[in-house]
Interface confidence: low
């Protein structure tokens, strides 16, 4: 740990602070009787340049005056921008084994003089806060530079503050510390911010304000709401605020939503009512605020309310359906469905529906609650019924539905005619149809009914289904449409009391199915071959199944073989076929075919038929 | 800007019991939902319970329901977490939270991403 400057000194000219572009002479002096031992003809005096602690460049070539063994002086030219680290050292050249002894260092700062400061900008938070001011200090000087942020006004009011900006921190903001109280609001007040570093100096435009140019309201605070009667629709929304605020901005919106209500309030004092809101519907709230009508800045927007408006009676009708399936001669069950209502209408949580299926001469009513969205009970078959469905919730009811519950496919005059299934992407299929030809009643509306055509669907699955109006001859639907699945779908064209129905099977997608069918047994009657089979397994048939396809040949024949095509029936299993050979063993397989194409063969069979031939 | 400051835990027999408390001294405290979430080493952020800024409404994760009570001093500016029939499960780093929103009478939300302003969490380690 040698004290570097205990040999000598380094100087610098013109100072050790120079503008960008400018040379410098540097001097390196030996104290006297310092030196080499013995031979001060053997100093020699070295100057080193070090950038970040990195040696850049041995100066050996830059010396402009030498003063043998005891001072040198070095010209440097091009320093970059910031600080640069000269080191002087002794080399004792007849010594070679030593390395060069430390002298004494100096730093060089290469900077600019401040620009004059520009957009100064001062702001008050809130009426108790304190005045702050920013500025634009244009480039960076690279050398430690003093602010002077200086403000006067009313009464000789005078206030400055002082910051530095150096290669650690930036000086563009200084808190003055002083509130201006509203009691000066129409009075004018002036801020300047002054530069100076050891280059130069440069002083900002006068920037001159009043109260209101710069004081920001604080957000408003502690937002509550109250709803009126405990409406779900109207609520006085209210809030603090700082004493001179007179105007107020007040935002909202349900919170899925993606555009804001926006209200303006003057002289709202904290307090103000909304009227149209949506009924159980989660709201954001946010508040700004303004100290004066024309002039002045708006605060930041409060925090949100978030909250939830309250619930109110139910409105619109429910979309209701029916099934009806006889029991025996003199029961029915009748399985009521109805579609949920959507927020807007349902306007809080539904809690129960109130159900009444009633006989129309008033003889029989069936009333009851459900939680649920359907209903089935066993009625009479005798007499001429009506179902009714409301939703509740906990302010009240929705105005009951009504509907006639007649034989659905009663009326083959009310039958629609041509009915056809399309599909039209994956996920839907366009039902078109038309009119029914002689009805004796007008039809009052359509409706397109459809489920998958799946073990145990009727059971297991509601329907879905959608309402027309008569006038349209053509339903998209899509709720629960999916690839690969045939639907049955029927059109029911629907007058006051009757009914008619076309049916028809439909898929959005089709592939050839993954097998055939599965033969089970071949049986002989009166010189005819009944071949029974399985159907495809569900999952398997991958879309709707147009028809079947039967196949034979004679055992170890090359030709091709004999086909007999069925159109599809899912409550068929058997076929006959006739044109067999008695005494001839077959080979017998079965295909299926969808509008894709036809699967690969079922399982072969062998049969030898031993009738007469036909 | 609202600090938020736990205490109250400490090491508990399986079976004990505790109460937390969660102290602010913002002005805007008593308008928010405050939650309680805990954190076992490696686990994530796990909500415990939650009241609303009036104490109508509260809500509680389904494994602290009938053993864990939330609730709110006179002052609304601190609010309790009382923990009964404590188990070794229990054990976590509990924190105290105040949503980001002054939340409605209805407003409890059980997601962490809705409070903005955390405590530095209290130790509770329970013992079999």
């Known amino acids: 740990n040698i004290d570097v400057c205990k040999l000598g000194t380094v100087t610098v000219q013109p100072a050790p602070v120079i503008p960008l572009g400018s040379a410098a002479n540097i001097s390196c002096s030996l104290n006297p009787k310092q030196g080499c031992s013995h031979y001060p003809s053997s100093n020699e005096l070295i100057l080193l340049k070090f950038v970040n602690d990195v040696l850049v460049e041995n100066l050996h070539g830059k010396k402009v005056h030498d003063h043998t063994g005891h001072s040198s002086t070095f010209q440097v030219t091009n320093l970059s921008l910031g600080m640069t680290l000269f080191v002087c050292k002794l080399n004792c050249s007849n010594s070679q084994k030593k390395p060069p002894v430390p002298v004494c260092g100096v730093e060089i700062s290469v900077g600019v003089a401040p620009e004059p400061p520009q957009n100064i900008s001062c702001v008050q938070e809130g009426e108790n806060g304190t005045v702050a001011c920013s500025w634009n200090s244009g480039k960076v000087t690279y050398l430690k530079t003093n602010y002077t942020l200086q403000l006067s006004g009313p009464n000789n009011l005078t206030c400055q503050k002082q910051c530095f900006s150096d290669n650690r921190q930036n000086c563009n903001r200084l808190d003055l510390g002083i509130n201006l109280s509203p009691d000066l609001a129409e009075s004018r007040f002036i801020v300047r911010v002054t530069a100076i570093n050891d280059l130069g100096n440069s002083s900002s435009l006068p920037h001159t304000f009043t109260f209101l140019d710069i004081v920001i309201p604080l957000p408003p605070w502690d937002i509550r709401i109250n709803f009126l009667n405990a409406s779900g629709s109207r609520g006085t929304l209210q809030w603090e605020d700082e004493g001179q605020v007179v105007l107020n901005q007040l935002r909202y919106q349900p919170l899925n939503s993606t555009s804001w209500n926006m209200v303006n309030a003057t002289n709202a004092k904290g307090k103000y009512d909304l009227r149209d809101l949506r009924p159980f519907t989660e709201y954001e709230f946010q508040i700004s605020s303004k100290l004066h009508l024309s002039g002045g800045s708006w605060s930041n927007w409060s925090e949100s309310l978030r909250t939830r408006t309250p619930e109110e009676e139910p409105v619109g009708i429910l979309d209701i359906w029916y099934m009806k399936q006889d029991i025996d001669y003199d029961r029915q069950q009748i399985s009521l469905f109805w579609k949920s209502l959507n927020p807007s209408e349902a306007r809080g949580k539904i809690l129960h529906y109130q159900v009444t299926l009633q006989e129309v001469t008033k003889k029989t009513t069936l009333q009851n609650t459900t939680r649920h969205t359907s209903w089935t009970r066993v009625i009479p078959r005798t007499g001429a019924w009506t179902a009714s469905v409301s939703a509740a919730n906990s302010k009240g009811a929705s105005a009951p539905t009504h509907i006639n519950i007649v034989d659905l496919c009663g009326t083959g005059l009310l039958a629609p005619h041509q009915v056809s299934a399309k599909s039209e992407n994956m996920d839907n299929i366009l039902v078109t149809w038309q009119p029914p030809k002689k009805a004796d009643s007008a039809v009052r509306e359509y409706i397109v009914e459809w489920r998958a055509l799946q073990p145990g669907s009727i059971t297991k699955f509601p329907p879905h289904w959608l309402r027309i109006p008569p006038d349209n001859m053509s339903a998209l639907i899509s709720e629960n449409i999916k690839p690969y699945i045939c639907y049955e779908i029927r059109v029911h064209a629907l007058s006051e009391s009757q009914g008619g129905c076309s049916s028809i099977r439909g898929d959005s997608k089709h592939k050839a199915p993954v097998s055939g069918p599965h033969i089970t047994a071949i049986t002989e009657k009166k010189e005819r071959l009944f071949i029974s089979w399985t159907h495809i397994p569900f999952p398997e048939q991958r879309g709707c199944i147009l028809h079947y396809r039967i196949y034979w040949k004679e055992r170890d024949s090359t030709a091709q073989p004999e086909l007999c095509e069925i159109q599809y029936r899912r409550s068929q299993n058997s076929h006959p076929i006739s044109s067999l050979q008695p005494r001839v063993t077959y080979v017998l397989w079965m295909t299926a075919v969808t509008a894709a194409g036809e699967s690969p063969q079922g399982n072969e069979r062998e049969f030898c038929p031993q009738g007469k031939a036909n | 800007q609202v600090q938020l400051q736990e205490s109250g835990g400490g090491l508990v027999q399986a079976g004990g019991s505790l109460r937390l408390s969660c102290a602010s001294s913002?002005?805007?405290?008593?308008?928010?939902?405050v939650g309680w979430f805990r954190q076992a080493p490696g686990k994530e952020r796990y909500f415990v319970a939650a009241i609303s800024r009036d104490t109508a409404y509260t809500d509680y994760a389904d494994s602290v329901k009938g053993r864990f009570t939330i609730s709110r001093g006179n002052a609304k500016n601190t609010v309790y977490l009382q923990m009964n029939s404590l188990n070794p499960e229990d054990t976590a780093v509990y924190y105290c939270a105040a949503s980001h929103i002054y939340s409605g009478s209805h407003y409890i939300s059980a997601r962490s991403s809705d409070y903005m302003y955390w405590g530095q969490g209290t130790q509770v380690t329970v013992s079999s």
């Open positions: 913002g002005r805007t405290f008593s308008s928010r939902t």
